[in-house]
């Protein structure tokens, strides 16, 4: 708390200027007007405030906003978010993009602080939905948020933001995010002519069922072997020998090297070693000839 | 600098159960995923369940119904309360979190499944 003293003879701030940096604390709160500064705010950036300036400004806005700043002064704060607590934040109703932008460029080259987390969660909240525009910005500034939302909250972004998901963004997602993610994504790209349709979908992939795969093999893609060994097993393990060889292309001969990793290795198992062969790769591990193959998960669902 | 550090690994019996911990050393994040995958030798890392900041959670199908992820705020802790163990869950278990969009990963604890 600052004390409550008398301003000076003289030294009442008519206006947000260099002349206050000059001013020890207790003159900063009894000659700056509360209203003053928050008319003002887009000054105080320009001037180079100490922390200790800053936070009697702090408190001085905090007098005059006990519910919580308005957006015109949010807006303008600059480098005094920084000096923000989360429960400020949480008192706050940002509604408008151009603000939030203003800030996360305050705490920009920076890791995500709990404030702008608070502010991030406020503004989504505020708005009702991951919308395109707030999806580019915030991906912009954080690749990795869209990871750290649960498959509950990804399920209200909309398909057309998925435009700015970029495949960085979806680095640390887990696969029951992408399993949220990839029919929006299919839904997006739909128009895409073939080619430009992978690229796309490509980083999305990790969510794909096996038709999708199917179809995909069908296309003449040439998935590289990092994109295939990121698919669901689930996925991969009913797609033919002959699938997998038109869906990779000429990456085909990668298999070898993944031969005991997941998903090849389980789906090596499904297939038959004469239709293996045939791959001229010398995988290993299939079903040798003669042996019937029984689909136990077809035959419960008949029964 | 975020820092997540595992303990609890060992040897345990087939059919056994465990649990493991992963220390989180701060808590002021509001947005996270926090995951357990696990390495066993000549293989790739596995993802096996996640826990969000909603407090839903989500579970690879190699261990749905056997392995519960949970998360003590009040202690900055993660845990891996795993069940009805297999051979084949001998791993390196590795926690990993998504805090406030960047990513980072424990040193890793070994669990060996054997009689």
């Known amino acids: 708390e600052v004390e409550k003293t008398a301003c000076p003879s003289g030294k009442k701030a008519r206006e947000i200027d260099e002349s206050l940096i000059f001013y020890k604390k207790w003159e900063l709160e009894a000659c700056v007007d509360a209203a003053l500064l928050a008319t003002q705010m887009d000054r105080v950036n320009a001037i180079p405030f100490t922390y200790e300036q800053l936070d009697v400004l702090k408190h001085k806005l905090d007098e005059l906003y006990p519910q919580g700043y308005p957006e015109s002064v949010i807006q303008h704060l600059g480098y005094l978010f920084l000096k923000m607590s989360p429960e400020d934040i949480r008192k706050w109703n940002v509604t408008s993009l151009e603000t939030l932008k203003a800030l996360l460029e305050v705490n920009k080259g920076h890791e995500m602080s709990p404030q702008v987390a608070t502010l991030i969660d406020r503004f989504v909240k505020g708005r009702g939905q991951l919308d395109k525009d707030t999806l580019d910005t915030l991906t912009a500034f954080y690749p990795g948020y869209l990871c750290s939302l649960s498959p509950e909250e990804l399920s209200s972004v909309p398909p057309s933001s998925i435009w700015a998901v970029r495949p960085q963004d979806l680095d640390t997602c887990d696969p029951r995010q992408l399993d949220v993610l990839y029919p929006k994504a299919r839904l997006a790209f739909q128009n895409m002519n073939g080619s430009e349709y992978f690229v796309k979908i490509q980083s999305f992939l990790g969510g794909a069922p096996t038709e999708d795969l199917k179809a995909l093999s069908q296309q003449n893609v040439s998935m590289d072997l990092a994109t295939f060994m990121k698919l669901r097993t689930d996925a991969v393990l009913p797609l033919t020998v002959a699938e997998v060889q038109k869906l990779l292309g000429p990456h085909v001969e990668g298999l070898k090297a993944e031969e005991r990793h997941r998903p090849v290795r389980d789906w090596i198992l499904r297939q038959r070693q004469d239709d293996l062969d045939t791959l001229g790769l010398g995988l290993q591990g299939g079903i040798p000839n003669g042996y019937l193959v029984l689909d136990l998960s077809m035959q419960e669902a008949l029964s | 600098q975020l820092q997540l550090v595992e303990s609890g690994g060992g040897l345990v019996q087939p059919g056994g159960s465990h649990r493991l911990s992963c220390a989180v050393s701060?808590?002021?994040?509001?947005?996270?995923?926090m995951r357990w995958y696990r390495q066993a030798p000549g293989k790739e890392r596995e993802w096996l369940t996640s826990i969000y900041s909603d407090g839903s959670s989500a579970y690879a199908d190699s261990v749905k119904d056997r392995f519960t992820i949970s998360l003590d705020n009040a202690k900055n802790m993660l845990y891996l309360q795993m069940n009805s163990l297999k051979p084949e869950d001998t791993a390196v278990y590795y926690c990993?979190?998504?805090?406030?969009?960047?990513?980072?990963w424990g040193q890793g604890t070994q669990v060996t499944v054997a009689s």
């Open positions: 701060v808590s002021t994040f509001t947005r996270y995923a």
């Open positions: 990993n979190a998504n805090v406030d969009s960047k990513a980072y």
